[in-house]
C-alpha cells in the first residue's frame, strides 16, 4: 500500500507559531509499542501455494538496521500435486514502510526519514488475460 | 517481519560526544524517496485464490494519517470453480511498520516513532493439521 | 497478543435464546480467524464453527447449523454467538479461540482462548 505525500502540512508548526529552526523537527528517544510482536502463520513461506524466499538487507545506519524482501519462487502457483501450474500466477504483496536514516559528522547526529518498499509476501492470483485476435 | 529492538544505540551518540540533550533527536524535514511508488499487480485482493477486503484508519496526528490492513475474506481458499475449498486456507500476512506520532502543547511541537502491525494481504497455504479420525 | 473475554454465559430456560460476546484485546482483530468451542461436563471440547477475519466466511459444525449462529464486529473488536431453541445438551462451558489459520482453530490448537463462560440449560 501507498504512503501519500507529507505534502508541507504534517512536519509544520501551526501557521501562528514560529517557524521550525533549520529545517529539523524534535525526535523523541523511545518506540511507542516497541514491544508488540508479530505473529504470523506457521512457516507460511514454504507451505504457501504462491511460495517465496527471504533476502535480508543490512545497513547499520538505517532504523531497522535488516530490512527482510520476499521474493516469489514460482511463475505459476503450487497445485495439490506439488507442481506448478502456469494457468495461475503468483504475484508479489508489497508495502510501502517508513525507516529512518543516520547522518553524522562527527559528533553532529540527525536522522531523517525515507520511504522504503518492502515485498512482504507472495499470492496467488487467477490471471487477467487480454486476449489478442489476429484477422 | 518483525523490527528488532533499538537497544539503546541506533539514536545515541558515538560514547566519545556530549549525550544528545533532553531526551531528543534532530529528524530533518523532508523524506527520502517520497515519490517512490507501489506497482502491484492489478486487483490482486479480489483475484487472489485467498482474497482479502481493506480497512482504512485514519489519525491526523500520525505519518502516514492513513493505515490500510486487510482482513482475508474466506476461512478456506477459492478453488478453480470459484467455490471456497477449506482443504486450505486463507492466512494473513504481516508486516511491521513505522509511523510518527505527532504531540503537540501550544507551538511545541515534538515527534515519536511508534511501531505498527500491519496486514497487507492474505496467501493460500496448505494445512498443517490433518484431522486425526479416532476409531 | 490478543487476549479474549466471553460474556454472556448463564442459565435458561429449554426452548430459549442466548447470545454469547468475545472482547478481544489487541489492534488487530480483524487478521484473526475467531469461533467457537464448547465442552460439556466428562466431555472433550466440540467445535462449533468458525469465522474469518472479513466476516464473509462462516464454517459451521454440522450438528449446529441451524440453531447457531456466529458474527463478529471488527470495529467492536468482538466475537458472537447467537443461540436459539436451545436444549439441555447445550449445557457447557462455551471458549472463543482465535487463530490466523483456520485449520488450526478448527482442531483445538489455536493460539488464543478465552476463560470460558457457563452456560446452562434447564429443562
Known amino acids: 500500500r501507498k504512503i501519500p505525500k507529507v505534502g508541507h502540512t504534517f512536519f509544520q508548526k501551526p501557521e501562528s507559531c514560529p517557524p521550525v529552526p533549520g529545517g529539523s523537527m524534535k525526535l523523541d528517544i523511545g518506540i511507542i509499542n516497541e514491544n508488540q510482536r508479530v505473529s504470523m502463520s506457521r512457516n507460511i513461506e514454504s507451505r504457501s501455494t504462491s511460495p517465496w524466499n527471504y533476502t535480508v538487507t543490512w545497513d547499520p545506519n538505517r532504523y531497522p538496521s535488516e530490512v527482510v524482501q520476499a521474493q516469489c519462487r514460482n511463475l505459476g502457483c503450487i497445485n495439490a500435486q506439488g507442481k506448478e501450474d502456469i494457468s495461475m500466477n503468483s504475484v508479489p504483496i508489497q508495502q510501502e514502510t517508513l525507516v529512518v536514516r543516520r547522518k553524522h559528522q562527527g559528533c553532529s547526529v540527525s536522522f531523517q526519514l525515507e520511504k522504503v518498499l518492502v515485498t512482504v509476501g507472495c499470492t496467488c492470483v487467477t490471471p487477467v488475460i487480454h486476449h489478442v485476435q489476429h484477422h | 517481519r518483525k523490527i528488532p529492538k533499538v537497544g539503546h544505540t541506533f539514536f545515541q551518540k558515538p560514547e566519545s560526544c556530549p549525550p544528545v540533550p533532553g531526551g531528543s533527536m534532530k529528524l530533518d524535514i523532508g523524506i527520502i524517496n517520497e515519490n517512490q511508488r507501489v506497482s502491484m499487480s492489478r486487483n490482486i485482493e479480489s483475484r487472489s485464490t485467498s482474497p482479502w477486503n481493506y480497512t482504512v484508519t485514519w489519525d491526523p496526528n500520525r505519518y502516514p494519517s492513513e493505515v490500510v490492513q486487510a482482513q482475508c475474506r474466506n476461512l478456506g481458499c477459492i478453488n478453480a470453480q470459484g467455490k471456497e475449498d477449506i482443504s486450505m486456507n486463507s492466512v494473513p500476512i504481516q508486516q511491521e511498520t513505522l509511523v510518527v506520532r505527532r504531540k503537540h502543547q501550544g507551538c511545541s511541537v515534538s515527534f515519536q516513532l511508534e511501531k505498527v502491525l500491519v496486514t497487507v494481504g492474505c496467501t493460500c497455504v496448505t494445512p498443517v493439521i490433518h484431522h486425526v479420525q479416532h476409531h | 497478543e490478543v487476549q479474549l473475554v466471553e460474556s454472556g454465559g448463564g442459565l435458561v430456560q429449554a426452548g430459549g435464546s442466548l447470545r454469547l460476546s468475545c472482547a478481544a484485546s489487541?489492534?488487530?482483530?480483524?487478521?484473526?480467524?475467531v469461533g467457537w468451542f464448547r465442552q460439556a461436563p466428562g466431555k472433550e471440547r466440540e467445535f462449533i464453527g468458525a469465522?474469518?477475519?472479513?466476516?464473509?466466511?462462516?464454517y459451521y459444525a454440522v450438528s449446529e447449523k441451524d440453531r447457531f449462529t456466529i458474527s463478529r464486529d471488527n470495529g467492536k473488536n468482538t466475537l458472537y454467538l447467537q443461540m436459539s431453541s436451545l436444549k439441555a445438551e447445550d449445557t457447557a462451558v462455551y471458549y472463543c479461540t482465535a487463530d490466523q489459520e483456520f485449520g488450526y482453530l478448527r482442531f483445538g490448537r489455536s493460539e488464543y482462548w478465552g476463560q470460558g463462560t457457563q452456560v446452562t440449560v434447564s429443562s
Open positions: 469465522i474469518s477475519g472479513s466476516g464473509d466466511s462462516i
Open positions: 489487541g489492534r488487530t482483530f480483524s487478521s484473526y480467524v
